[in-house]
């Protein structure tokens, strides 16, 4: 106790009343109003507690302080008076703050700020939603993955910021009247082949697939080394020329020069060059046979081998090249008498007749095309008068029954040397190379030199033997009728070159022999 009569032991936050008593300071309370022992304490009164008489008024919050309290405007409100704190409702000047006006970028991108009492909300633009972890940030709604599946199945959904598009898939296009983009887009497959939107090389044929296309080698063409077939970037090369090379074991400069020309023509060959290439090959062949040069010095068997090789190769080459021609009838003739007649058509149901100087061929169009072959149908006939020089003394191999019959009727036939070629040899070819057994026969009418009376006239064809050479044969060919200078033959195949031959039993010098291919 001090001399002035004031207790010195008063607890914290209290003041002495006299020498023996203390009282809590304003804003504090103790168990009893007067404190008489130092064990008692003064505790802060929470004026903001629910039962308190303090009222700060609306839009405000009461903040308890040590020994007192403050009234402050609630978040989102501010005092008009400017005073940050006040003590009661009568001093309250709190009013709503318009955060949207204060900070226009409050909702960042893609949202609109909406003021509310004491706060604000962000309203997202169409195609956006509030981010759960940041409710003030609008993010793009991915309509394509949100499970709404807003697009037609013929389209694919393309999400973009704030929106989406229903676009036609690659290789598809909007159906007539449909847009391309909105959610009502409906698409259909584009036929790139017929619409010309493909990038197929000219060495290939375009095939449409669902949503795409592929490029396949033309008939008679093969993919270039290392490039697969049936791709968009497939490039093919013509097989026509690569296999037509000089026969092995034959040494002839004249023949080598001919094949050099063939290879030169094949080197930069393109489908559009088919017409010129056919003409150039036949021109070269015409010249070769007009002036065979050292071919004439070869042994007879080798000459037959060369003839066989030329006839066989020419058929393949012309078949391959003619598939690239446009529809119509072509006739070419050359100085030494070589002649080509060719008809190209889309499949038609009729017979076709090709007429030449020394021969006429008639057959059914439906023989020409192999089923499933997309190319045009081709029927061709070639005459090569010069081939007779190479086929002189070529053997005839008869079927046993024909041999027996001839032995009985033409005694001298089999005793007196090789048969003689009466006519040009004609070679017929089709786009279809499977001509071993035609469903309906082909008819040839040959014009030829006069037949010596009592001699047998045979319709024959050149059969390419396994040895690469060949011989005349009659299998599958029959003689329908013969007059002095013409003969009609009917054959059930075009396996190689149908020919007309006369068998003489009178020995005489061979005339200049002519051949049609």
């Amino acid at each position: 106790q001090d001399s002035r009569g004031c207790a010195r032991w008063c607890p914290q936050d209290s003041s002495c009343v006299n020498a023996t008593a203390c009282r809590c300071n304003p804003g504090f309370s103790s168990f009893s109003e007067i404190i008489t022992t130092p064990m008692e304490t003064c505790d802060d009164i929470n004026e903001c507690a629910t039962l308190s008489k303090v009222s700060c008024g609306k839009f405000s919050d009461c903040w308890n302080t040590e020994g007192s309290y403050d009234c402050v405007c609630s978040p989102g409100y501010e005092p008009v008076s400017g005073a940050k704190t006040f003590k009661n409702e009568s001093e309250n000047t709190c009013q709503d703050v318009d955060e949207c006006q204060q900070n226009p970028r409050l909702c960042k991108s893609y949202g609109t700020c909406v003021n509310t009492l004491g706060s604000y909300t962000c309203q997202c633009l169409p195609g956006f939603k509030l981010k759960p972890e940041d409710p003030k940030l609008c993010t793009d709604v991915n309509e394509c993955t949100s499970g709404q599946n807003p697009c037609h199945s013929s389209t694919h959904c393309l999400n973009n910021v704030g929106s989406y598009q229903c676009r036609c898939r690659p290789g598809w296009q909007p159906i007539p009247g449909s847009p391309n983009g909105p959610n009502n887009t409906v698409c259909e497959d584009v036929d790139e082949c017929s619409s010309g939107q493909h990038q197929c090389d000219s060495s290939t044929v375009c095939f449409n697939t669902v949503g795409s296309y592929s490029c396949r080698c033309r008939p008679g063409w093969k993919p270039r080394h290392g490039i697969p077939n049936n791709q968009k970037d497939t490039v093919c090369e013509d097989m026509t020329f690569s296999t037509w090379t000089p026969p092995p074991g034959v040494h002839s400069q004249t023949l080598s020069r001919f094949f050099d020309k063939v290879q030169d023509l094949g080197r930069d060959y393109k489908p559009g060059l088919a017409n010129n290439t056919i003409q150039s090959i036949l021109q070269a062949l015409d010249e070769l046979l007009e002036a065979p040069g050292d071919l004439e010095t070869l042994p007879r068997l080798q000459q037959h081998c060369v003839a066989s090789h030329l006839l066989d190769g020419l058929e393949d080459v012309l078949r391959g090249l003619s598939k690239n021609l446009s529809n119509g009838l072509l006739n070419f003739s050359y100085p030494a008498g070589t002649e080509l007649s060719l008809e190209v058509q889309k499949q038609v149901d009729r017979s076709v007749t090709l007429r030449q100087n020394q021969a006429v061929m008639q057959l059914d169009w439906n023989q020409a095309q192999k089923s499933g072959d997309p190319g045009p149908s081709v029927v061709g006939l070639v005459s090569i008068p010069g081939m007779g020089k190479l086929l002189a003394e070529a053997p005839l191999v008869l079927e046993p029954e024909k041999q027996m019959l001839l032995h009985e009727t033409h005694q001298g036939l089999l005793q007196d040397g090789s048969p003689i070629l009466l006519s040009d040899v004609i070679s017929a070819f089709l786009s279809n190379n499977d001509t071993q057994n035609l469903s309906s026969p082909v008819t040839f009418t040959f014009s030829h030199r006069s037949v010596i009376p009592r001699q047998k006239v045979l319709c024959v064809f050149w059969e390419h033997g396994q040895n690469g050479c060949g011989h005349w044969a009659t299998t599958g060919c029959s003689t329908i009728g013969t007059r002095d200078t013409s003969t009609i033959c009917r054959c059930t195949h075009l396996s190689s070159f149908a020919v007309l031959m006369a068998h003489y039993d009178v020995q005489e010098e061979d005339p200049v022999l002519t051949v049609i291919t």
């Epitope: 020309k261 030169d264 930069d268 393109k270 559009g272 017409n275």
Partner: antibody, heavy 118, light 106 residues
Framework: QVQLQQSGAEVKKPGASVKVSCKAS????????MQWVRQAPGQGLEWMGA????????RHTQKFKGRVTMTRDTSTSTVYMELSSLRSEDTAVYYC???????????WGQGTLVTVSS | EIVLTQSPATMSASPGERVTMSCSAS?????MHWYQQKSGQSPKRWIY???KLASGVPARFSGSGSGTDYTFTISSMEPEDFATYYC?????????FGGGTKLEIK
């Protein structure tokens, strides 16, 4: 009748590019390769390359590889030859000519004089 | 590449004279063509495929040869024949021209 009409004369600076056109008429554009041949003043003929209008396939000499571009526009039956990184020695008359292996170059354009000078 | 050498490079002749020029190839050639060019004009195809005369070419012109040696002949010179003649091969890429033979009036 077959005609090949070339674009007019050009004067270019070294390092620049020139594009010469050749418009074909009177025949089926895709039935022949189109050749490009040049002739420097007082010199002989020099083959540069060729383009096949049917598919845009090209051939050219090693000498011009990387510098010459040959293209075609089938809708207008026109072929183009672009020569880049021009040098003074590229000054020449440039010809287009229709060509086929067995027939040679049977029709020629009137020629386009390209002068390269600084 | 196949190099074509033409000889002579220049030759003089009088009208009525027979003229022969040659083209020698460094390798065998199967398609040889010849062109005529007059000063200030585009070349013209003159003979193709060794011996075939282009349309409008007079019969006094002829071509022959095979392999590596080819010949171009004018049986009787006419005043309009004075020009430069080029041979050209089409047997391998790159296509090549000979250096030309200039035919001058004597």
């Amino acid at each position: 009748q077959v005609q090949l009409q070339q674009s007019g004369a050009e004067v270019k600076k070294p390092g620049a590019s020139v594009k010469v056109s050749c418009k074909a008429s009177g025949y089926t554009f895709t039935n022949y390769w189109m050749q490009w041949v040049r002739q420097a003043p007082g010199q002989g003929l020099e083959w540069m390359g060729a383009v096949y209008p049917g598919d845009g396939d090209t051939r050219h000499t090693q000498k011009f590889k990387g510098r010459v571009t040959m293209t075609r526009d089938t809708s207008t039956s026109t072929v183009y030859m672009e020569l880049s990184s021009l040098r003074s020695e590229d000054t020449a008359v440039y010809y287009c000519a229709r060509g086929f292996t067995a027939y040679g170059m049977d029709y020629w354009g009137q020629g386009t004089l390209v002068t390269v000078s600084s | 590449e196949i190099v074509l050498t033409q000889s002579p490079a220049t030759m003089s002749a009088s009208p009525g004279e027979r003229v022969t020029m040659s083209c020698s190839a460094s390798s065998s050639v199967s398609y040889m063509h010849w062109y005529q060019q007059k000063s200030g004009q585009s070349p013209k195809r003159w003979i193709y495929d060794t011996s075939k005369l282009a349309s409008g070419v007079p019969a006094r012109f002829s071509g022959s040869g095979s392999g590596t040696d080819y010949t171009f002949t004018i049986s009787s010179m006419e005043p309009e024949d004075f020009a430069t003649y080029y041979c050209q091969q089409w047997s391998s890429n790159p296509l090549t021209f000979g250096g030309g033979t200039k035919l001058e009036i004597k």
